[in-house]
């Protein structure tokens, strides 16, 4: 059967079909159906609503639509017993004590089961202590601290602003720097965008909301007790203290109100600089300690969270491929929320949903898509990618044979600015096809491409005239499909102005406001973004799945690969006269990353000239391309990541959000000149290069002729 | 065999812009890097701006950064530069120049006859 | 001023033997590859030696390169007076992202 047979109609019919199917009515509908009530992962509600989605993708015409479960580490508030932080006097008494909860927005004050603001994850204690602000509580915040400003936070409450780099990584970063405790807030610098109302009156955070988050340092593991293997009824659980990735020491968010009342009375060394100040009105002194009057004060934290092993469920659809049945293209994103998830994840969740009810559509008319489309709605993403995890540990063996692709779907939108994209080199050519047969939202475009107004918008800060995509890193569910497994892997959605727009993802974010209002009013009224999203995620789903020859172009690898060894390159000669006296030389490096070009450009020329009607030809030079991906996995991942493998791409040891190129190579340097050792040092730097150098060579080969 | 030849050349006014474009056979045009590299009378060989196979990103010399656009056209197998802004010592003959090995740029097997640009008022 | 810097000129007579060097930093010559072009008077330049030290075919082994740290050299023995051109070298800078020549060499034949 030709594809053309199996489809029925001409590709093109096709494509437009599926795209004029999707409607920004029901994404809005589907929107304001996923947010009524809370969603948290491992509740009865979250279950009922994979239920309902079960039931509707069937009723949409998939093939199969399953329910998978998993017994997962997730961690909750104790209900009778309410975290909190408070200033105590020489006496003990708490004289001050932050919120409880955030003042539920107008219309749901009688919505049951909305979860306290907490960091999931944190361990119960009640340290107490003197107080040290440390800006960010990013890595080079703490350089400051301890190694220019000699400031020891050992044995410190220590409190950051939310912003810039995971949670996690803060957390970590405290943890090494010694503290007893951390207090996380959420800075007006970083979230009140100014000329704009709070909540519900903007969107903008009120002083009284609060970002929830993981604060977990997972490193790709999944659930923290099964590392490796699905959490199933028959997995061997680790006991908590050795648990993977749980924080040491109590975590806890304010918003800034309650912030204000703690950072208003610090006192001890001054802020170092500009960028260590925000919009409040407080000195933003580091401490440690209060000011004159204050200091026999204190801070304690009281925090009485459990963390307990509780089921949580997938849902699992597919559409049969006509052609190649056993190879995958899968759809996924997340459907547990902190909250009302009225943006993160159910912008995402309803986008999926109405592009499942176009290709049902589709299928009931007699149309299949060549290969087989997964459709995925993930538990548990908020308390550390477990739920697309543990589905891909129990699947391993099936996706790495069969994976071609992995679209993710979570938030449509962080803004209503412009496009972006973050995906495999492989994907670049697809994105940039795609957006150029699509209709541009924004206003000042119409009648112009999404490609122009991305182009204009969002321009490629290295390549004029192209718009910026940006390397995977992780937060969220691509994450094990390809760090671990090396399946090609790309996310889409709308975002903000990043250059008027400075703060830190968008200020309600994770919230009790991020609320169905708060999009159809302020975000996206027309559900314009959604659809185009929508069109973006879809389009390059329907691609992947149905063009006969796969869409992926391993030029744009070669691209990439000569402008990421030139990056590492440059960092290390920051230290030549090391190069010099430990012989590390990047040349082994450079030369297979020219022997990949020039291969990868034969390949391109074969692809281009072979017979496409051979079906063998065709699934050997597919199976070629697919096979790419993976072969850039390192079977034993990087040094103490052995769940992050991709050699050329993970997500950054600095900032779990940010992707790192040549992670092996660059973690070795980071940092380098502090080092003990540096003939260690400087050997694992050889041997990283050794290893990105074998690497690159041997994706090449995977592109020669076969005989 | 592999040619390149290029066209749009002439005489322009300071200010003024002009489009060059090298039509190219002989090879799989999309796989490859292809350049500009102009040449001032009586002086060196000066790199002016690459794009690379695939989706095409682009390189350019500082000193035409932001005046000078390099893009391609796979399906007519030619390249082109479009100047704008044009400055005196812009006056050269400018080459195509197709890569040896592919994507990026590595070193330049095969070259035009070059097109003479002249900015003068 | 071009980033890589080469002799403005090199002379030598018939039969002999010149050598043409081309200087560069760590960040061109010293990790990237380098090519030498060939550009007889009123002509395109002509690719003489890529990878350092390869030959495309069709060139005479008369020609040879090598390259040594941050410089590489461009050898011809059994100077002919066909040889009379131009010399380039060249090379990609990991710094500029960019493509870089030297200043050209004017070898001259003498006789």
């Known amino acids: 059967k030709s594809s053309s047979e199996a489809t029925n109609i001409t590709p093109k019919h096709n494509m437009k079909a599926f795209l004029d199917e999707l409607k920004a009515e029901n994404i809005k509908k589907f929107l304001h159906n996923f947010t009524q009530i809370p969603h948290l992962a491992g509740t009865e509600q979250n279950f009922q609503l994979a239920k309902q989605i079960q039931s509707q993708w069937k009723e949409f015409g998939l093939d199969s639509v399953e329910l998978t479960h998993y017994d997962v580490l997730l961690s909750y508030p104790n209900k009778t017993h309410p975290n909190y932080i408070s200033i105590i006097n020489e006496d003990g008494n708490e004289i001050f004590n932050t919120s409880l909860f955030e003042p539920p927005p107008a219309g749901y004050e009688n919505v049951s089961d909305i979860v306290p603001p907490f960091s999931a994850f944190s361990p119960q204690g009640m340290p107490e202590g003197d107080l040290v602000y440390v800006n960010y509580a990013r890595t080079e915040d703490f350089f400051k601290l301890e190694r220019d400003m000699k400031i020891n936070c050992s044995g410190k409450i220590v409190i950051a602003r939310y912003g810039k780099v995971f949670r996690g990584n803060k957390v970590k970063n405290a943890q090494l720097a010694g503290a007893t405790g951390v207090i996380l807030y959420s800075d007006p610098d970083d979230y009140f965008a100014p000329g704009v109302k709070s909540y519900p009156d903007g969107w903008n955070l009120p002083g009284g909301g609060v970002q929830r988050g993981n604060i977990l340092n997972l490193n790709g593991a999944g659930d923290p007790l099964t590392p490796g293997y699905p959490a199933n009824e028959y997995a061997y659980r680790r006991g908590m203290a050795e648990a993977v990735g749980l924080p040491s020491i109590p975590v806890h968010p304010i918003g800034y109100y309650d912030a204000q009342k703690l950072l208003e009375k610090m006192g001890g060394s001054a802020s170092p600089d500009s960028s260590w100040r925000g919009s409040l009105k407080v000195p933003y002194n580091v401490g440690p300690g209060f000011t004159g009057n204050f200091s026999t004060q204190k801070v304690k934290m009281h925090i009485h969270s459990t963390s307990e092993v509780t089921r949580i469920y997938n849902v699992i659809g597919t559409l049969r491929g006509a052609v190649e049945p056993d190879r995958y293209v899968i759809l996924g994103g997340h459907r547990d929320s902190w909250v009302f998830g009225g943006i993160d994840p159910q912008s995402g969740a309803a986008v999926v949903h109405e592009i499942v009810r176009s290709f049902g559509m589709l299928k009931k008319e007699g149309w299949r898509p060549r290969r087989t489309i997964l459709f995925a709605s993930w538990d548990a993403e908020e308390f550390g990618l477990l739920g697309s995890t543990e589905w891909a540990e129990e699947n391993s063996r099936l996706l790495q044979e069969r994976g071609v692709a992995y679209i993710n779907a979570d938030s449509s939108i962080e803004g209503n600015y412009t496009l972006r994209v973050d995906c495999t080199p492989l994907m670049y050519s697809l994105v940039y096809n795609l957006t150029k047969e699509l209709e541009s939202p924004d206003e000042g475009f119409e009648g112009k491409s999404l490609y122009e107004s991305w182009t204009k918008k969002s321009p490629s800060p290295e390549f004029s005239g192209m718009p910026r995509i940006s390397k995977l890193g992780s937060g969220n569910d691509f994450e094990v499909f390809f760090q671990r497994l090396g399946i090609a892997s790309g996310r889409a959605r709308y975002t903000k102005n990043w250059e008027t727009n400075k703060f830190s993802s968008y200020p309600l974010y994770h919230s009790v406001y991020e609320t169905y209002e708060l999009v159809e009013k302020f975000y996206d009224p027309m559900f314009k973004y959604h659809l185009t999203v929508a069109q973006v995620r879809g389009g390059m789903v329907f691609e992947l799945a149905n063009s006969v020859v796969l869409p992926f172009d391993c030029r744009d690898y070669a691209v990439v690969l000569r402008k990421y060894a030139d990056k590492i390159y440059n960092i290390s000669m920051k230290h030549p006269q090391e190069m010099k006296t430990y012989s590390v030389s990047f040349d082994s490096l450079f030369s297979a990353v020219k022997n990949f070009t020039e291969i990868a450009s034969k390949f391109s020329e074969r692809l281009r000239d072979f017979d496409k009607s051979n079906p063998i030809l065709l699934r050997m030079m597919n199976d070629q391309l697919m096979f790419l991906e993976r072969a850039f996995i390192d079977p034993l991942g990087l040094p103490d990541r052995p769940f992050y493998r991709h050699v050329i791409y993970a997500p950054s040891s600095h900032n779990k959000y940010a992707g790192e190129s040549f992670p092996g190579i660059y973690d070795a340097l980071f940092d380098i000149e502090s080092k003990v050792d540096p003939s260690q040092a400087w050997g694992e730097v050889k041997r990283q290069i050794s290893i990105a150098t074998f690497t690159v060579q041997a994706a090449a080969e995977t592109l020669s002729e076969v005989a | 065999e592999v040619q390149l030849v290029e066209s749009g050349g002439g005489l322009v006014q300071p200010g003024g812009s002009l489009r060059l474009s090298c039509a190219a056979s002989?090879?799989?045009?999309?796989?490859?890097?292809m350049s500009w590299v102009r040449q001032a009378p009586g002086k060196g060989l000066e790199w002016v701006s690459a794009i690379s196979g695939g989706s095409g990103s682009t390189y350019y010399a500082d000193s035409v950064k932001g005046r000078f656009t390099i893009s391609r056209d796979n399906s007519k197998n030619t390249l082109y530069l479009q100047m704008n802004s044009l400055r005196a010592e812009d006056s050269a003959v400018y080459y195509c120049a197709k890569d040896g090995v592919g994507a990026t740029p590595y070193y330049f097997d095969y070259w035009g006859q070059g097109t003479l640009v002249t900015v003068s008022s | 001023q071009s980033v890589l810097t080469q002799p403005p000129s090199v002379s030598a007579a018939p039969g002999q033997k010149v050598t043409i060097s081309c200087s560069g930093s760590?960040?061109?010559?010293?990790?990237?590859?380098v090519s030498w072009y060939q550009q007889l008077p009123g002509t395109a330049p002509k690719l003489l030696i890529y990878?350092?030290?390869k030959r495309p075919s069709g060139i005479p082994d008369r020609f040879s390169g090598s390259k040594s740290g941050t410089s590489a050299t461009l050898g011809i023995t059994g100077l002919q007076t066909g040889d009379e051109a131009d010399y380039y070298c060249g090379t990609w800078d990991s710094s500029l992202s960019a493509v870089v020549f030297g200043g050209g060499t004017k070898l001259t034949v003498l006789g």
């Open positions: 990878d350092n030290n």
């Open positions: 002989g090879f799989t045009f999309s796989s490859y890097a």
């Open positions: 760590s960040s061109n010559i010293g990790i990237n590859y």
